[in-house]
């Protein structure tokens, strides 16, 4: 650590008076201090004599001795007063700059201790201190205000009492700046803007901030706007606002618009986009297929989304059947809004009964004209199965009859005993029947097939099965032949109601 | 060994705001007092201010635009220079301000244009 | 204008002895301690001359320095091609509370 000599905390000189600080260390040595116009400065390998041979009010301050090589950085220092009847202060610095609720140090030295006790801090012109002002003094570093408030930023003076008679010093600013969490807020209205060519538009960018020192612009496809700003201060906070109005849009006025507010901790920015058409128009579309399929008994959620500007002047969902003339429950049909331009309008359909199957419209109107947007709704059902035996053309003749959506796809089985469904270890033989005639297929209804087994002669103890499947589930009906005549048997978890 | 870099935007739109930050390496800068100064192009040099930790003293001819402020975490100090025009523009250095007023260490200079 | 006032040009042969000179006013180089600056072409200054007459590490014992009054001069003996710089004086000022300088001199190496 570095020696200063004369090895006392603080020194008090006369002004005129001759000063030598001697600085010792092991390598070189440095002097820091306030920067003063009267010392004079000899270095000397590892000593630095720091001196004056007129020391005047301004060489009021603590001098520190460095070793700049010395890896823990030690230090020594000295507290030196020139006490001049005429100025008790020395002013270190003209403004003082903190954020809110930091102590703010204000540099006034005093250059006489013996003053100390007759010290005080005053606003300029004598005006006292704002209430709830709290601060401390140190004759060898100023005037502390503790946790210093935006309110206070003021210009200050320290005052002493010498002979009866309170001396000012030169005043101090200080500049008490609020804690800015980071960039303006920001606000670009609208986020999105359409317009037919010649209607009149407003587009607003506004930034606010807790302190006032931010700058806010807009720019139109990279070109900033000269507009007029407007500021105002409310909720503690500042804002600048710019308004641009056009009376009649053109193509040139579409593109893109950003909204730019930069302060010290950084810049934010904003945009939104303007499309200038030369009509109304109004689109539908769906990201689900216009058709669709659905199990019996399952919901489903008819989805459009809109288009339009300008605005949607009436709207509807209706049913087109074929089944019956009633239309959808208003209370299913639901709309959202994306934005101002687009919306999205959903049917909900829970539930669906055999009789909802069909087509359903989604309307809408604005001064564009009428667009419609149509769903095919088909209900897929399991099979349903019935055999019953019969003779065509002479021969005995099994004949299944399966309805359902999609197609069923028809299997005959032949089994040993009687049985309601015959299982693996009782098959005696299996028939598909890729071809079953269609006996009806119409838009939104069941498909009927019917699939014929011929059979010479019934086998008493056996059971004969008919078995349909599609994507939905299945349906099986078994036939027992039996002395008396013909028996049947649908399957028990047949029973079946949507 | 103390080093400095001025860093900072080299192009300012008339009217606007010179922002400029120091970064001091090899020495902490609440130690120090430090300056700034300018000097326009094939001219000599002008003082605008120094700063250490407890506040600042501006050149009165630039006092109202100038504001300087010192950032101890992150060793930098900084230099606000406010409704800039041509006569702005010049390469802008910072430096150590000794006890005697001596600027012993100086940044490199970072050139500021004031353009539109 | 500078506060303090330079020759804008000086030079001299290597080898050979110049001075530059820097004259000022009661509030600066008449109260105060000089310094001198030496600018390289493209260059940062660099503080060649302290307290007058003192040189920081590094710099060669050619280059001194001297105060008389409100004046004060820079001579550089010895000279060689590396010594072509802009040399500036600089001394505080007391009213304006920080350091002036002068316009500077161009040193050529001829």
């Known amino acids: 650590i570095p020696v200063i000599e004369p090895s006392v905390p603080e020194l008090v000189v006369k002004p005129g008076a001759t000063v030598t600080l001697r600085c010792v260390g092991n390598g070189s040595v440095e002097w820091d201090g306030p920067p003063s116009p009267h010392w004079t400065l000899y270095s000397d390998g590892s000593s630095s004599i720091l001196s004056t041979n007129n020391a005047t009010f301004q060489n009021t301050g603590t001098y520190r001795c460095t070793e700049p090589g010395d890896p823990l950085g030690g230090s020594a220092a000295i507290h030196l007063y020139v006490k001049d009847p005429a100025r008790p202060w020395n002013v270190l610095a003209q403004e003082v700059v903190v954020f809110e609720d930091q102590d703010a140090l204000l540099p006034c030295l005093l250059t006489d201790p013996v003053l100390e006790a007759g010290v005080s801090l005053v606003r300029v012109r004598g005006r006292p201190l704002m209430r709830h002002t709290n601060y401390s003094f140190s004759p060898w570093h100023g005037f502390t205000i503790h946790r210093a408030k935006f309110i206070q930023s003021q210009d200050y003076q320290c005052s002493a009492l010498m002979g009866g008679r309170k001396v000012m010093s030169i005043s101090i600013r200080l500049k008490v700046q609020k804690v800015i969490p980071g960039p303006p807020a920001l606000t670009l209205v609208p986020a999105e803007l359409v317009r037919i060519r010649g209607e009149a538009a407003q587009i607003v960018c506004s930034a606010s901030s807790v302190d006032v020192n931010f700058d806010v612009f807009l720019q139109h496809n990279n070109t900033k706007l000269a507009i007029p700003q407007q500021s105002d201060f409310h909720n503690n906070r500042y804002q600048k606002v710019l308004t641009l109005n056009l009376d009649q849009v053109d193509f040139q006025h579409a593109g893109n618009y950003s909204c730019v507010a930069s302060n010290v901790q950084g810049k934010h920015s904003t945009s939104m986009f303007f499309r200038v058409v030369e009509s109304a128009y109004l689109n539908l579309s769906s990201e689900q297929n216009l058709i669709q399929e659905v199990t019996v008994g399952e919901g489903l959620n008819l989805k459009v989304m809109v288009e339009a500007y300008p605005g949607l002047q009436g709207f509807n969902w209706t049913y087109l059947g074929p089944f019956s003339d009633h239309q959808p429950e208003p209370k299913l049909a639901n709309a959202t809004t994306k934005d101002t331009y687009r919306h999205t309008f959903t049917l909900s359909l829970p539930r669906l009964k055999p009789s909802e199957a069909g087509r359903y419209s989604f309307l809408a109107r604005n001064p564009g004209g009428w667009r419609a947007l149509t769903f095919e709704l088909t209900l897929r059902y399991p099979p349903e199965v019935s055999v019953i035996w019969t003779f065509i053309n002479g021969s005995g003749t099994l004949l299944c009859a399966a309805s359902g959506y999609p197609q069923p796809n028809v299997t005959w089985l032949q089994c040993s005993g009687h049985t309601d469904r015959c299982d693996e270890a009782q098959v005696l033989q299996v028939w598909d029947d890729p071809y079953p005639e269609v006996l009806s297929q119409e838009p939104f209804h069941k498909v009927t097939v019917q699939s014929l087994l011929t059979v010479e002669t019934l086998e008493h103890n056996q059971t004969y099965e008919c078995r349909a499947h599609n994507s939905v589930g299945s349906g099986s009906w078994a036939f027992i032949p039996i002395s008396a005549g013909a028996h049947t048997h649908p399957p028990d978890e047949f029973l079946f109601t949507p | 060994q103390v080093q400095l870099q001025e860093s900072g935007p080299g192009l300012v739109k008339p009217s606007e705001t010179l922002s400029l930050t120091c970064t001091v390496s090899?020495?902490?800068?609440?130690?120090?007092?430090w300056s700034w100064i300018r000097q326009p192009a094939g001219k000599g040099l002008e003082w605008i201010g120094r700063i250490y930790t407890s506040g600042s003293t501006k050149n009165p001819s630039l006092k109202s635009r100038v504001t300087m402020s010192v950032d101890t975490s992150k060793n930098q100090f900084s230099l606000k220079l406010s409704s800039v025009t041509a006569a702005d523009t010049a390469v802008y250095y910072c430096?150590?301000?000794?006890?005697?007023?001596?600027?012993?260490?100086w940044g490199q200079g970072t050139l500021v244009t004031v353009s539109s | 204008q500078s506060v303090l006032t330079q020759p804008p040009s000086a030079s001299g042969t290597p080898g050979q002895r110049v001075t530059i000179s820097c004259s000022g006013g009661?509030?600066?180089?008449?109260?105060?301690?000089v310094n001198w600056y030496q600018q390289l072409p493209g260059t940062a200054p660099k503080l060649l001359i302290y307290?007058?007459?003192q040189r920081p590490s590094g710099v060669p014992d050619r280059f001194s320095g001297s105060k008389s009054g409100t004046s004060a001069s820079l001579a550089i003996s010895g000279l060689q091609s590396e010594d072509e710089a802009d040399y500036y004086c600089a001394a505080w000022d007391d009213s304006l509370n920080g350091p002036v300088f002068g316009g500077g001199t161009k040193l050529t190496v001829l």
């Open positions: 430096a150590r301000l000794t006890v005697v007023g001596a600027l012993d260490y």
């Open positions: 009661s509030s600066n180089i008449g109260s105060n301690t």
């Open positions: 090899g020495g902490s800068i609440s130690s120090y007092y």
């Open positions: 307290s007058n007459n």
